[in-house]
Amino acid sequence: AILGRSETQECLFFNANWEKDRTNQTGVEPCYGDKDKRRHCFATWKNISGSIEIVKQGCWLDDINCYDRTDCVEKKDSPEVYFCCCEGNMCNEKFSYFPQMEVTQPTSNPVTPKP
């Protein structure tokens, strides 16, 4: 079952290492792939003393962790390199960091974890 799926045909492209990698620095990347596979956009960046440094943006291959994500949001707490992916054309144009801590559920039957 797939709800409200948005096709991704192009993504914002950026490569901070463009000279070494011999690519464009910025632009729009068409996303290619097998017809039976989904496509996504992604962004990776670093936070150096409060200053955002984009590492890469572009197309991302079919990845179930990117399904149903219309916005590019990194939710991991304090990653070394920030990463987000999303579905929809140019959805990686804007990206954000919204850390979500683990939710611990109180339980009436405490379980002793296996060693």
Partner: antibody
């Protein structure tokens, strides 16, 4: 520490139903897709079902389509597998697995045994 | 229907090198299938060894390496040890939420 703890397995008659649960801890459950994988006695691993981060997209191997339903409760950090119309060939250890980016299974539970027999 | 194939069994001498392969019936395995490898000993849950073709999971010794060899994914174990005797499974992500496991390879470390 990431932990996945399956429960709900047991002995059931052919045609019966079971609901498996997988309690997750040690990571932000709602940020990751999850999957169920099973292993029949003496056989190899078989992917059964997967579910996206929101639960909006669900996927199944052909042999369980229409009989099994995967779901998740992100507020309870729990993954479920509702198994109906069970058959002898569904007898297996059922593992839940966390899916990381690049769509691989980075953590596994210890498994719960489902036996379908009359 | 996609079938992922692995060698059913393999033997290696202690200290030797072995390469297990993973192919499928509908074409060549490429990095876009995110090949991953798992080790399982009897009665235990699988352990993740390699993901995304060639990235070692944390805590996995560098004796284990992944690659694409020709049209197959490959797992190479160099300097095999007695405790490498296990079942090894490859998995391909076919896209659109579907994974397919190989049948597994039973690795025997001789001696």
């Amino acid at each position: 520490e990431v932990q996945l703890l399956e429960s709900g397995g047991g002995l059931v008659q052919p045609g019966g139903s079971l609901r498996l649960s997988c309690a997750a801890s040690g990571f932000t459950f709602r940020n990751y897709a999850m999957s169920w994988v099973r292993q029949a006695p003496g056989k190899g691993l078989e992917w059964v079902s997967g579910i996206s981060v929101t639960g909006g997209s669900t996927y199944y191997t052909d042999s369980v389509k229409g009989r099994f339903t995967v779901s998740r409760d992100n507020s309870r950090n729990t993954l479920y597998l509702q198994m109906n119309s069970l058959r002898a060939e569904d007898t297996a250890v059922y593992y839940c697995a966390k899916v990381y980016y690049s769509s691989f299974f980075d953590y596994w539970g210890q498994g719960t045994l489902v036996t379908v027999s009359s | 229907q996609t079938v992922v194939t692995q060698e059913p069994s393999f033997s290696v001498s202690p200290g030797g090198t072995v390469t297990l392969t993973c192919g499928f019936n509908s074409g060549s395995v490429s990095t876009s299938y995110y090949p991953s490898w798992y080790q399982q000993t009897p009665g235990q849950a699988p352990r993740t060894l390699i993901y995304n073709t060639n990235t070692r999971s944390s805590g996995v010794p560098d004796r284990f390496s992944g690659s694409i060899l020709g049209n197959k994914a490959a797992l190479t174990i160099t300097g095999a040890q007695a405790d490498d005797e296990s079942d090894y499974y490859c998995v391909l992500y076919m896209g659109s939420g579907i994974w397919v496991f190989g049948g597994g390879t039973k690795l025997t470390v001789l001696g």
